[in-house]
């Protein structure tokens, strides 16, 4: 016992955690002070009633990552005020109903992997009326839905359900709820899938599938009633499709009339690019999807992919579209003609290089688009990229950072509408008049800049933290500034006469620099109390570095002596 | 400056494995590829493979499947290449290359020389 | 396989001419309007350099008498006017499909 309760720490306010240690019972001594208990990750098998009888204000109970394998019925009887319970990862192999029927106030609980087959044989959780976030389900052992499982709850933020093994679904068991902000369903196979999502189109706002095989799936007609779809945002995660299932799933996506999302994370198309085009012509309508995610496409046969013209249609309605992180290196100029209302996209870690991405903007290219995104790819100089976008009219944000430019020339072409640009992470050690006039945001941190003496008349925001500037920059360069973040720089100092010269100027962020603590600095930081105001990062990331003594201390709490401040 | 730097020679018995490494510097390593090419002695150019930092995903020329494997240590910034069973067809040099745009070898390293013989 | 058949195997030429090596693949290296066909440069002893990517696009430090020509399977590369520095061995390489394929080489000579 005395063990036990040496692994466990409780605050001031009732927060108790002993998480990750050699538990193996709940710590004995537990009073209604307690608020919050985290306990994950230890040994504890066996949950008695007694245990918990006297945690009658407990709000949070984490359990997660025990071996607990019996529950006793009214282990939980006292816990009226508990909204979050967290039993996930044990060996509970029958849940009861008696459990929860006194968590009147639970708005979270998490009963995913343990290894029950069923979610009992009553309704667990039709006495939670204030449920919120419900998890449910295991990899392996949990083949069967019922039609009570979900009875009594009316409305859940999110349920997600591990199904990775579903060999059972009795019709209308999802039905029940009328309304699931996210449902998140694990399914290894298929088999089920056009059951689940009939009961569920009229109910749920965003319907996300992981970790499924679509290899083979067909689209069957569906019986989806008078009902209309509620299903706004499909996403696929960890999902297998080939060329000819994709268009099956097109199909079903069909079906959901107002479907305006779609996001495709970690899947993998084993495919070539051989969507045929009589397939497409019959059943392929886009709808009024209008965002489009793919984040870590992995195409195995990437080279061998062809024309894929047959979807170019689809795509004339969409108005944003990421492809991050998926090796592309080319958006053949067909495609980008047809995208007639794209005006975000977002093409962020992947290979694209001045030369093809010319092909990709080329004539009549993205017409609409106004914020490009080229994060973390492999261009390598900024005449030959602004001059590569000058065929985009309306382009007004580009954000090129994390690309390695090294040197930046005198002059330069950009879209002539140009108003947010980002150069972060880009190892530049200059800016120049290649720097567009038209800016209103610039993003210059961390790089390798000890200058900046641009005349940017419209700039309003400015971000050049993590370079190696010495001094404020020239106000009278900048004379609609509202935002300068500076911090991580090596400036020493900054004066009054400094600040008041940035008219506009209501936020400044200049921490995390190398400041000298004379006299003078400490008595204007110090003395204007309007100053925390501007200062964001006041008074936590204002440091001295010197004199020596006083180094590391915050610059509000640096009081130096007479002496030091009077010398003649 | 970019730059690709290998481990020396080898003399390895037939029979034997061997582990060449290409070290990166001057940029981002998880950024690009680095691929894997075969120059036999007076002989033209033969593709082994590819390897992306960022997921460790590996595309090879049928020809190298069984021969090659490919690694990357994104800590230190360097790539691997274990050739298995080698035999006096293997004695080359071999050079690691970056992959940049998807499609074209921008940067190489200066080539590891591999003998191969008893 | 594509297979990329480069011709002349070596070309013999006077300083300040024009050389031009021709490369023709076995099927087309077209990827949506742009053909994966690259050129490199190898003096003896040393790794070969990129001189062109994308059939026609000079890489970055490349002396500008060096330009690439061609589309679908036919390509060229053009050196004008040659130099002494030029006198070595030429490659062509296709990026279209797997496996990344290159030339026999070119290897060029003084006349």
């Known amino acids: 016992e005395s063990s036990n309760q040496a692994s466990l720490s409780c605050d001031r306010n009732g927060i108790c955690k002993g998480s990750s240690g050699s538990l193996n019972s709940i710590p004995s001594g537990l009073t209604e002070a307690v608020k919050s208990l985290d306990l994950s990750n230890n040994r504890i098998t066996y949950i008695s009633n007694s245990d918990l009888q006297r945690c009658v204000n407990l709000q949070a109970l984490v359990l997660t990552s025990n071996g607990i394998n019996t529950i006793e019925e009214d282990s939980f009887s006292s816990l009226g005020s508990l909204e979050h319970l967290d039993l996930s990862y044990n060996y509970l192999s029958n849940l009861s109903s008696s459990w929860f029927k006194p968590l009147s106030s639970l708005t979270f609980l998490n009963l995913l992997g343990n290894p029950y087959k069923t979610l009992g044989e009553t309704s667990l959780f039709s006495h939670l009326t204030k449920l919120q976030i419900l998890r449910v389900g295991n990899m392996d052992t949990f083949t069967k839905i019922q039609r009570k499982d979900f009875a009594g709850l009316t409305f859940l933020e999110e349920l997600e359900i591990d199904a990775s093994d579903l060999q059972s679904y009795e019709p209308k068991s999802l039905k029940s709820i009328q309304n699931v902000s996210h449902l998140i369903l694990h399914m290894k196979q298929h088999i089920l899938l056009l059951e689940i999502f009939v009961d569920v189109t009229s109910s749920v706002e965003c319907l996300e599938l992981r970790d499924t095989d679509l290899d083979t799936f067909h689209f069957s007609e569906l019986s989806t009633g008078e009902t209309n779809s509620l299903i706004k945002k499909f996403t696929f995660r960890n999902v297998k499709i080939t060329d000819e299932s994709l268009f099956q799933v097109m199909k079903l996506l069909n079906q959901i009339s107002g479907l305006l999302e779609l996001e495709f994370d970690d899947c993998t198309l084993n495919g070539v690019g051989n969507f045929r085009a009589s397939d497409n012509d019959r059943v392929i309508d886009p709808g009024k999807v209008e965002t489009l995610t793919i984040r870590r496409l992995h195409i195995p046969r990437f080279y061998l992919f062809y024309d894929l013209s047959t979807l170019y249609s689809l795509t004339e309605r969409v108005k944003r579209i990421t492809v991050e992180n998926s090796k592309v290196f080319l958006v053949p100029c067909l495609l980008s003609q047809h995208l007639k209302s794209l005006e975000y996209l977002d093409l962020s870690e992947n290979l694209m290089v001045e030369e093809y991405l010319k092909n990709s903007a080329c004539e009549d290219a993205w017409p609409s688009l106004q914020t490009l995104i080229l994060r973390q790819n492999h261009l390598a100089s900024l005449e030959k990229t602004g001059e590569t976008l000058l065929t985009l009219k309306n382009l007004t944000n580009i954000d090129i950072s994390k690309n390695s430019f090294h040197s930046m020339p005198e002059t330069c072409q950009w879209p002539e509408k140009m108003k947010y640009l980002n150069l972060s992470s880009t190892r530049i050690h200059s800016v120049t008049g290649c720097i567009p006039k038209t800016l209103e945001i610039l993003d210059v941190s961390n790089n390798n800049l000890n200058l900046f003496s641009l005349n940017l008349p419209q700039l309003k925001e400015l971000y050049i933290s993590r370079n190696k500037l010495m001094t404020l920059p020239d106000a009278s360069l900048l004379p609609m500034l509202l935002v300068l973040k500076i911090s991580r720089n090596a400036i020493t100092t900054f004066s009054k006469e400094q600040l008041d010269s940035f008219h506009t100027l209501k936020t400044l962020e200049a921490g995390g620099n190398n400041f000298i603590c004379s006299c003078e600095f400490l008595s204007f930081t110090q003395e204007q109390q309007a100053l925390a105001k501007v200062l964001i990062d006041w008074p936590a990331n204002y440091l001295c570095d010197s004199p020596s003594h006083v180094r590391g201390q915050q610059v509000q709490d640096v009081r130096l002596s007479v002496s030091e401040c009077h010398r003649t | 400056q970019v730059q690709l730097q290998q481990s020396g020679p080898e003399l390895v018995n037939p029979g034997a494995s061997v582990k060449l490494s290409c070290k990166a510097s001057g940029f981002t390593f998880t950024t690009y590829g680095i691929n894997w090419v075969k120059q036999g002695p007076g002989q033209g150019l033969e593709w082994i493979g590819w390897?992306?930092?960022?997921?460790?995903?590996?595309n090879f020329n049928e020809n190298f499947k069984d021969k090659a494997a490919l690694t990357v240590d994104t800590s230190s910034s360097t790539a691997y290449m274990e050739l298995h069973s080698l035999t006096s067809e293997d004695s080359a040099v071999y050079f690691c290359?970056?992959?940049?745009?998807?499609?074209?070898?921008?940067?190489w390293g200066q080539g590891t020389t591999l003998t191969v013989s008893s | 396989d594509i297979v990329l058949t480069q011709s002349p195997a070596s070309l013999a030429v006077s300083l300040g001419q024009r050389a031009t090596i021709s490369c023709r693949a076995s099927?087309?290296?077209?990827?949506?309007?742009?053909?994966?066909m690259q050129w490199y440069q190898q003096k003896p002893g040393q790794p070969p350099k990129l001189l062109i990517f994308?059939?026609?696009n000079v890489e970055s430090g490349v002396p500008v008498r060096f330009s690439g020509s061609g589309s679908g399977t036919d390509f060229s590369l053009n050196i004008h006017p040659v130099e002494e520095d030029d006198i070595v061995m030429y490659f062509c390489?296709?990026?279209?499909?797997?496996?990344?394929?290159f030339g026999g080489g070119t290897k060029l000579e003084i006349k």
């Open positions: 994308g059939a026609s």
């Open positions: 390489q296709q990026s279209r499909k797997l496996p990344w394929t």
């Open positions: 099927e087309s290296v077209e990827y949506y309007g742009t053909s994966l």
């Open positions: 290359a970056r992959l940049t745009g998807g499609t074209f070898l921008d940067w």
């Open positions: 390897i992306y930092p960022r997921d460790g995903s590996t």
